[in-house]
């Protein structure tokens, strides 16, 4: 009888674990959907505002090829930095290549010096994988140096010419990025 009760208890516990996993997956999926929705809104806002503006990038933004970059003069934690970029119809910087990284670090050297700037890179809590905000993985040469010993969520930032990692709840400058307006001439 006791063995039967113990077996039932174990089965119930197993069921509970499965349900918790399902809930966790659903929460992640929901978060991902919400983020993609924000991306679409940012993209739309960018397209609409660009339509009324003839220059490829807004004032105080830097252009490089098809991208416009904004280097903040304010400090935020990583999540607030992302929200700040979204308000501007942009997203936190996503570095696609070494060439882009070199452009960013070169520009930072000229305007600000050796400060920390959040970019759109964060570590997935479950898998430990690094992901850009659109869900893609960074190329092998653009993985942050494992500097953070934080037990909290870890996010990526640029300093000097390096990509580093840190607790997402610390205050740093940040860099936003959006598409440059194509000339209609």
């Amino acid at each position: 009888k006791l063995l039967q009760v113990s077996t039932i208890a174990m089965q119930q516990q197993e069921k509970l674990i499965q349900q918790e996993r399902a809930l966790l997956n659903f929460t992640e999926w929901k978060r991902s959907c919400a983020l993609q929705m924000k991306y679409c809104q940012a993209f739309m806002q960018n397209s609409l505002s660009s339509a009324h503006n003839s220059s490829p990038c807004p004032n105080n933004w830097i252009q490089n090829r098809e991208s416009c970059y904004y280097v903040s003069e304010i400090w935020s934690i990583w999540h607030t930095s992302q929200e700040n970029c979204l308000k501007e119809g942009s997203t936190l910087l996503q570095i696609e290549s070494k060439e882009e990284m070199d452009f960013i670090t070169g520009s930072l050297r000229k305007i600000k010096g050796s400060y920390d700037y959040w970019v759109g890179l964060s570590q997935d809590g479950h898998s430990g994988r690094w992901l850009w905000q659109d869900g893609s993985s960074p190329s092998p040469g653009l993985l942050p140096a494992e500097r953070s010993q934080s037990a909290n969520q870890v996010c990526g930032y640029v300093k000097s010419n390096s990509l580093l990692s840190s607790n997402c709840s610390t205050w740093k400058y940040f860099i936003c990025e959006k598409y440059a307006l194509r000339s209609s001439v």
Epitope: E73, I74, W75, S76, I77, T80, S81, N84
Partner: nanobody
Amino acid sequence: QVQLQESGGGLVQAGGSLRLSCEASGRTFSTYAMAWFRQAPGKERDLVAAISWSGGSTEYHDSVKGRFTISRDNTKNTVYLQMNSLKAEDTAVYYCAAEVEGSGREGNFYGASWYPGQGTQVTVSS
């Protein structure tokens, strides 16, 4: 944009006191939160203390609770940080910061964005 001018930093013996001041200009001072951050070499930037626009709400880093007091004088556009019982681990550059308009709700200092000042060095010798 806000301009911030810190003063009051310096060298002090462990157990001693210092009072940092920060004068703000360029915006109506009494409408936004103010804070003090600090950064020691090789360490992350920490929020030491913050105060709401009215002075009605304050927040302190665990390591300074009971030793540091943040206050503001809206008639003088100035925020203060009174630091008592200073320890060697309080050595850092201290930055005054002004809340970015509309970035935080009353008392929600962690969700806010901040305009930083230039910083003032505080060194505590043991």
